[in-house]
């Protein structure tokens, strides 16, 4: 099976994958991300996208010795991105060319919006069997960052994916580097 | 066969604690969240909380988290529950439910019941 | 927490009859809505999950559909065996809610 794959979505309305909770301990886990868009005009060959830019990301999930029973699903929020209230100006100039006449100081980034905790069960090499809780994110937003924000914290970095069996290659993906925790 | 198999009726005073059991078998103890839930008359059906029998780790109802403590013993595949200074109130039958999943991804429904377990306060 | 509503809280049928209980959800629960039978013995069985999926071992005279904050439970064929008291359940966000039952009577 694979170690996970990624559709890229450009939907505003992202409904919920139906999955679900809490956690301490780290999860060792594949992150599917996108590249780092950026722009400097607002024309029609523009790369940054129009609200948000979603990632439907499938994984395995492993800890230690054992491994997801199923891939997990959820969504990957990443890129640039216009706010809805920005869309209408999009042609034609407007609203649209003053915002992005700001960009030094202001940048749209698309951000995690709706999280939601979910159980999973991880098979055993042994033959056991163990349950988790992750958090997974099921809709993304446009958020406005401006100089004062961290860099950091928009930032992209290249991040290994887990290797949930031995046989699995081992793909490295420009990602947003986030950790699932376990409860 | 997914069984789950609880303790006795208990007649306790108030102020007293009870500790309520739930026997599993035929299933991986570890890989299923395992939740309680209170049947009284008056409130029909009130989820308590959920243990993770892997971890250990619990999360509670706020309303039943000064009332209810849940733990388990991995050794015999037992769940248990145990209620602290009973009043009147606390006269309910409880169930565990076992967390259901559909290849190895949970929609949130318990699919497996214990019979249940009465419980009454009175002096 | 999320409220839970079934607003017929008795109903009587005939065998053979459709049978249709509702539930509502005072916010949009995504789908996470799932159906219990308690038994008059107190017995508790799962139905349905995620709105529409049924259990195993359950009959398909039983099924569920809805979205958003509105749910509903169909038994196609009403038999003797059903007559129970149904639960509904969400699980969109914690603590789960029940909804206070709905019990099914012969007519």
């Known amino acids: 099976f694979k170690n996970d794959a990624t559709e890229i979505l450009y939907s505003h309305v992202v409904k919920p994958v139906p999955a679900h909770p809490s956690s301490n301990s780290t999860l060792n886990q594949a992150r599917n991300g996108g590249r780092h868009f950026s722009s400097t005009g607002l024309d029609r060959n523009s790369r940054v996208q129009v609200g948000c830019r979603e990632l439907r990301s499938t994984k395995y999930i492993s800890d230690g010795q054992c491994t997801s029973i199923s891939p997990l699903k959820e969504l990957v929020c990443a890129g640039e991105c216009l706010p809805l209230p920005v869309l209408p100006n999009w042609i034609g100039g407007g609203y649209g060319t003053k915002y992005w006449s700001r960009r030094s100081s202001q940048e749209w980034r698309c951000v995690n919006d709706k999280t939601r905790t979910q159980r999973i069960q991880l098979q055993c090499q042994d033959g056991s069997t163990r349950t988790y809780k992750i958090t997974v994110v099921t809709a993304c937003k446009c958020k406005r960052y401006t100089r004062q924000h961290n860099e950091s914290s928009h930032n992209f970095e290249s991040v290994s994916p887990a290797k949930p069996a031995q046989h699995h290659r081992e793909r490295k993906r420009a990602s947003k580097s986030s950790k699932h925790s376990l409860s | 066969e997914v069984q789950l198999q609880q303790s006795g009726p208990e007649l306790v005073k108030p102020g007293a604690s009870v500790k309520i059991s739930c026997k599993t078998s035929?299933?991986?103890?570890?890989?299923?969240?395992m939740s309680w839930v209170k049947q009284s008359p008056e409130k029909s059906l009130e989820w308590i909380g959920e243990i993770n029998p892997t971890t250990g780790g619990s999360t509670y109802n706020q309303k039943f988290k000064a009332k209810a403590t849940l733990t388990v013993d991995k050794s015999s595949s037992t769940a248990y529950m145990q209620l602290k200074s009973l009043t009147s109130e606390d006269s309910a039958v409880y169930y565990c439910a076992r967390e259901g999943y559909y290849s190895g991804i949970s929609y949130d429904a318990m699919d497996y019941w214990g019979q249940g377990t009465s419980v009454t306060v009175s002096s | 927490d999320i409220q839970m509503t079934q607003t017929t809280s008795s109903l009587s049928a005939s065998l053979g009859d459709r049978v249709t209980i509702s539930c509502r959800a005072s916010q949009d629960i995504s789908n996470y809505l799932s159906w219990y039978q308690q038994k008059p013995d107190g017995t508790v069985k799962l139905l349905i999950y995620y709105t529409s999926r049924l259990h195993s071992g359950v009959p398909s005279r039983f099924s569920g559909s809805g979205s958003g904050t509105d749910y509903s439970l169909t038994i196609s064929n009403l038999e003797q065996e059903d007559i129970a008291t149904y639960f509904c359940q969400q699980g969109n966000t914690l603590p789960r809610t029940f909804g206070g039952g709905t019990k099914l009577e012969i007519k």
């Open positions: 035929g299933y991986s103890f570890t890989g299923y969240y």
